[in-house]
């Protein structure tokens, strides 16, 4: 089948990094600067992703593969393939529409992203507070006074990413 296709379509012989140039009798021409083709048999090369603004280049574009971007320092990626960047905050803060704000009393955030979450309520598990919570850290629950068995620290899942799109002021 492959041989038959080659006889019928000369473009199928054009390798990645080239395109089948209809203006030049369907010969394989190299992709122009700032473009690429990652598969063979392409009739055009795609323009490379440009990493600028809040994005920076993680991998340069080549004739056979697209550029890859990540975020500049002070920002983190959101979405598939780092489709957007969001401003970092300090631990103990969360990102709001007005910028980074400290976690309210009774909540914490131990990451540079995500939202402030309530401290664990130790009493719900019949335990007592062993170490008080802070803006940056959850409380540590210990055994209740009546409980002689050793207490276990509470484990909290990582904070989910907040809805993207707050600009740095």
């Amino acid at each position: 089948f492959e041989r038959t296709r080659s006889l019928q379509d000369p473009c199928s012989n054009c390798p990645a990094g080239t395109f089948c140039d209809n203006n030049r009798n369907q010969i394989c021409s190299p992709c122009p600067p700032n473009s690429f083709s990652s598969a063979g048999g392409q009739r055009t090369c795609d323009i490379c992703r440009q990493c600028k603004g809040v994005f920076r280049t993680r991998k340069e574009c080549s004739s056979t593969s697209n550029a890859e971007c990540d975020c500049t320092p002070g920002f983190h990626c959101l979405g598939a393939g780092c489709s957007m960047c969001e401003q970092d905050c300090k631990q103990g803060q969360e990102l709001t529409k007005k910028g980074c704000k400290d976690c309210c009393f009774g909540t914490f955030n131990d990451q540079k992203r995500g939202i402030c979450r309530p401290w664990t309520n130790c009493s719900l598990d019949g335990k007592s507070v062993l170490v008080n919570g802070t803006k940056e850290r959850d409380v540590v629950c210990g055994p209740s006074p009546a409980d002689l068995s050793p207490g276990a620290s509470s484990v909290t899942p990582p904070a989910p990413a907040r809805e993207p799109g707050h600009s740095p002021q």
């Epitope: 055009t44 795609d46 490379c48 440009q50 603004g53 809040v54 994005f55 489709s83 707050h166 740095p168």
Partner: antibody, heavy 119, light 106 residues
Framework: EVQLVESGGALVQPGGSLRLSCAAS????????MDWVRQAPGKGLEWVAD????????YYVDSVKGRFTISRDNAGNSLYLQMNSLRAEDTAVYYC????????????WGQGTLVTVSS | EIVLTQSPSSLSASVGDRVTITCQAS??????LNWYQQKPGKAPKLLIY???SLQSGVPSRFSGSGSGTDFTLTISSLQPEDFATYYC????????FGGGTKVDIK
């Protein structure tokens, strides 16, 4: 409140020069890339140029490369567009705009300044 | 150059109508697509960024969808202040705008 105010538009002869300014206020200017976008009378929007936070990185649309220079003065919270060898097709309202620093969208725009190139 | 083709170039609608504007990119631009509204004599205003995220302060009747090459801006119930020209813009590579869609009163 974020504000961008352009100035410097004028009537200029073909081949002449002009310098546009954009005064920024209400935000930390040094935290943002800035752009120039233009709109010819009765036509659509055309991106012209942008510049990074410290002024070391600049990009231009092909039609103005070698003729226009984008620059910024971070101490004075100002953006500039130096336009040389002006042509009739450069006639447009020129807007300065702020890159939102999240995905390449322009979240604040000035009111625009009109550049007319005619003899 | 990545070309953005908007359709229709103009449309007439009535208050309360559902309006849909499309923008087609000449190649895959993932979700690097933004929408702006412009009224005569005024600067453009950002409505939607990253294909579907609503800009702060923009009414929820505006929504965006799509990824890759095909994108849509929808106004669920047209209001008198929505009569304007709408532009799509790609920020995947060297920025570029679509030709615009003028929405006027039927």
């Amino acid at each position: 409140e974020v504000q961008l105010v352009e100035s410097g538009g004028a009537l200029v002869q073909p081949g002449g020069s002009l310098r546009l300014s954009c005064a920024a206020s209400g935000f930390t200017f040094t935290n943002f890339w800035m752009d120039w976008v233009r709109q010819a009378p009765g036509k659509g929007l055309e991106w012209v140029a942008d510049i990074n936070k410290d002024g070391g990185e600049k990009y231009y649309v092909d039609s103005v490369k070698g003729r226009f220079t984008i620059s910024r003065d971070n101490a004075g919270n100002s953006l500039y567009l130096q336009m040389n060898s002006l042509r009739a097709e450069d006639t447009a309202v020129y807007y300065c705009a702020r890159d939102a620093m999240r995905g390449g969208d322009l979240d604040y725009w000035g009111q625009g300044t009109l550049v007319t190139v005619s003899s | 150059e990545i070309v953005l083709t908007q359709s229709p170039s103009s449309l007439s609608a009535s208050v309360g109508d559902r309006v849909t504007i499309t923008c087609q990119a000449s190649q895959d631009i993932r979700n690097y697509l933004n929408w702006y509204q412009q009224k005569p004599g005024k600067a453009p205003k950002l409505l939607i960024y990253a294909a579907s995220s609503l800009q702060s302060g923009v009414p929820s009747r505006f929504s965006g969808s799509g990824s890759g090459t095909d994108f849509t801006l929808t106004i669920s119930s047209l209001q008198p202040e929505d009569f304007a020209t709408y532009y799509c813009q790609q920020s995947y590579s060297t920025p570029g705008f679509g030709g615009g869609t003028k929405v006027d009163i039927k």
